[in-house]
């Protein structure tokens, strides 16, 4: 019983939440809250938007982003791409892990020019010590953050 | 090996399924089937729509709801909100954990009067003993329950 | 500590990815890549599109499919069904586990005839040794595979 409890307490897990500072507009990944409210890190590190593995193994990684807008401004892509990407010292470029494409702008109803849509990604990937996972959304201007419950990013070892 | 198997057998987990009685129309949370078919409880309790933690720790909680309709009836909001909420003795009000907003009614095509959409939520949250998690959908009349495979609610300790 | 690490290394898990050969057009389930790139099997087997349990227990199973098209061809159903199904020697027919219905064709915007949508399913189910889980999409012609990051299928024991 002690063994079982210890194994849960040590199992790497994290849940990071959206915040006003999440959208940088710099072309970088989304940034996240790591401590306040529902956010926490247990056996994983955080660095500039990335969850960083401290222990090698398979992790279920997940992210949800809340999308929303009024109509679909011409300057915005009509296709939104939401993805989880791996950064590793072994490759110079980010590696796509899990990706979704949506066309949410067409969801405005005849009644309402405002539309909402949500994109959820989750899957098991292998991470070596020091490897990082980040979230990107293109076009990030359509991401709605608010209170940390609608857009988030997390992981746990399986 | 015995230790490893025991740890799996004792690990809190649950999967609850939609049923005809899930929609109360009372403004309360959705109710769920806990025993029949695919539904089960292992190390978690159930009470009036809520999964109740018997063991403190981090849980991956999830819910999917199937939404459907013909057009978008006037009495229904054009935005549907699907959320997982925590009830705790420490606060008088429910706490938002994971929330999605969708605008599904605009999805009927010229080809089709009937539209379908699905909302999935999942994420890691901390629960103390006795804390509860419930699912709410506004407007719940658009939720399709029926056979238990299209709308469901579950959790497991990570 | 050794015990805990061993338990993770032995915990059944898999992540299978979409490939050019995934869509058979034969009415069968989707087929998957099991070794290349992000795909792996650990303590689970694979057979003709199915993840096969080697160890009885509760598994979190998941699948995402990327859907896309140009308009909505009349020959295609306007409702897309994405589901996870169990095959067991105890029943002659597949058993629905987790299912979603979407109406993605209505998502083309006035800006763009091309639409994209994504369907994610995940939930905890019980599998006996030898029982299989497969993914089906109707109509599978709308599934977009590309590089294995957009459509995938996985599981891990909880």
């Amino acid at each position: 019983l002690i063994q079982e409890r210890r194994s849960h307490q040590n199992n790497p897990a994290a849940h990071l939440t959206g915040a006003n500072s999440s959208l940088t507009g710099s072309g970088g990944p989304l940034l996240w809250e790591t401590q306040l409210g529902l956010a926490f890190l247990r056996g994983l590190d955080y660095h500039d938007g990335a969850l960083v593995a401290n222990k090698a193994g398979y992790y279920y990684i997940y992210s949800k982003v809340q999308l929303g807008g009024v109509g679909c401004p011409l300057g915005l892509a009509s296709t939104i791409t939401h993805g989880l990407y791996k950064r590793t010292p072994r490759y110079p470029e980010e590696l796509e892990l899990l990706v979704s494409q949506q066309s949410p702008c067409g969801r405005a109803t005849s009644n309402s020019r405002v539309w909402w849509d949500s994109s959820f990604l989750g899957g098991v990937v292998h991470l070596e010590v020091g490897e990082e996972v980040v979230v990107r959304v293109l076009d990030e201007r359509l991401v709605r953050l608010r209170d940390g419950t609608r857009s988030y990013f997390g992981a746990f070892m399986v | 090996l015995i230790q490893e198997r025991r740890s799996h057998q004792n690990n809190p987990a649950a999967h609850l399924t939609g049923a005809n009685s899930s929609l109360t129309g009372s403004g309360g949370p959705l109710l769920w089937e806990t025993q029949l078919g695919l539904a089960f409880l292992r190390g978690l309790d159930y009470h009036d729509g809520a999964l109740v933690a018997n063991k403190a720790g981090y849980y991956y909680i999830y819910s999917k709801v199937q939404l459907g309709g013909v057009g978008c009836p006037l009495g229904l909001a054009s935005t549907i909100t699907h959320g997982l909420y925590k009830r705790t003795p420490r606060y008088p009000e429910e706490l938002e954990l994971l929330v999605s907003q969708q605008s599904p009614c605009g999805r009927a095509t010229s080809n089709s009067r009937v539209w379908w959409d699905s909302s999935f939520l999942g994420g890691v949250v901390h629960l103390e003993v006795g804390e509860e998690v419930v699912v709410r959908v506004l407007d719940e009349r658009l939720v399709r329950l029926r056979d238990g495979t299209r709308s469901y609610f579950g959790a497991f300790m990570v | 500590l050794i015990q805990e690490r061993r338990s993770h290394q032995n915990n059944p898990a898999a992540h299978l990815t979409g490939a050019n050969s995934s869509l058979t057009g034969s009415g069968g389930p989707l087929l998957w890549e099991t070794q290349l790139g992000l795909a792996f099997l650990r303590g689970l087997d694979y057979h003709d599109g199915a993840l096969v349990a080697n160890k009885a227990g509760y598994y979190y199973i998941y699948s995402k499919v990327q859907l896309g098209g140009v308009g909505c061809p009349l020959g295609l159903a306007s409702t897309i069904t994405h589901g996870l199904y169990k095959r067991t020697p105890r029943y002659p027919e597949e058993l629905e586990l987790l299912v979603s219905q979407q109406s993605p064709c209505g998502r083309a915007t006035s800006n763009s005839r091309v639409w994209w949508d994504s369907s994610f399913l995940g939930g905890v189910v019980h599998l006996e040794v030898g029982e299989e889980v497969v993914v089906r999409v109707l109509d599978e012609r709308l599934v977009r595979l590309r590089d294995g990051t957009r459509s995938y299928f996985g599981a891990f024991m909880v």
């Epitope: - | 309709g69 013909v70 006037l74 009495g75 009937v114 658009l142 | 409702t79």
Partner: antibody, heavy 121, light 107 residues
Framework: QVQLVESGGGLVKPGGSLRLSCAAS????????MNWIRQAPGKGLEWIAD????????YYADSVKGRFTISRDNAKNSLYLQMNSLRAEDTAVYYC??????????????WGQGTTVTVSS | AIQLTQSPSSLSASVGDRVTIACRAS??????LAWFRQTPGKTPKLLIY???SLESGVPSRFLGSGSGTDFTLTISSLQPEDFAIYYC?????????FGGGTKVEIK
């Protein structure tokens, strides 16, 4: 109880006009799509028009397009069918029907008793 | 327009018989199909919606099945009030259409 009552039918000459009404009671009228369906003597059922609850989106069968107009007044719990340029083949019993369209419940579950329209010279 | 073809157009059966009526759609309508019963001089009554869902208050001897293009209505044990005309109707696509009807008569 839930009820639909049609009125306004009668005998009319070819080329003439009629306005049918359907009074709803016992339910929240504004939550439902409403349909008009007709049945010629000794024949099957033919859908002719519907109107959405939310934004008054309207569709017609080709056989009546340009001649018939469906409308509703949610404040009065009433559905209407304005029929112009009537032809002999429009002779039928006209039914209004409520259509459910959300979640687990679909279909035209409540029908009126029908009103007879006869087009004859 | 989507055409619904019912078969047979008529059939003779006795009380207690099992009866099956088919409805074929000219293109895929998913599960957006309803079945109605109409007795002479009466309004149509909804029996089944969404291809297989039994309407509240309808006896369980009525069973709907199928999806896509092929649908069936089965009456497991015919009762006297079941001698009537049965219609299928698709509500997936405009214009809404009904099948031509199947008349169930007393043998």
């Amino acid at each position: 109880q839930v009820q639909l009552v049609e009125s306004g039918g009668g005998l009319v000459k070819p080329g003439g006009s009629l306005r049918l009404s359907c009074a709803a009671s016992g339910f929240t009228f504004s939550d439902y799509y409403m349909n008009w369906i007709r049945q010629a003597p000794g024949k099957g059922l033919e859908w002719i028009a519907d109107i959405s609850s939310r934004d008054n989106t309207i569709y017609y069968a080709d056989s009546v397009k340009g001649r018939f107009t469906i409308s509703r007044d949610n404040a009065k719990n009433s559905l209407y069918l304005q029929m112009n340029s009537l032809r002999a083949e429009d002779t039928a019993v006209y039914y209004c029907a409520r259509e459910r369209g959300f979640g687990d419940y679909f279909g035209m579950d409540v029908w009126g008793q029908g009103t007879t329209v006869t087009v004859s010279s | 327009a989507i055409q619904l073809t019912q078969s047979p157009s008529s059939l003779s059966a006795s009380v207690g018989d099992r009866v099956t009526i088919a409805c074929r759609a000219s293109q895929d309508i998913s599960s957006a199909l309803a079945w109605f019963r109409q007795t002479p001089g009466k309004t149509p009554k909804l029996l089944i919606y969404d291809a297989s869902s039994l309407e509240s208050g309808v006896p369980s001897r009525f069973l709907g099945s199928g999806s896509g293009t092929d649908f069936t209505l089965t009456i497991s044990s015919l009762q006297p009030e079941d001698f009537a005309i049965y219609y299928c109707q698709q509500f997936n696509t405009y214009p809404l259409t009904f099948g031509g009807g199947t008349k169930v008569e007393i043998k």
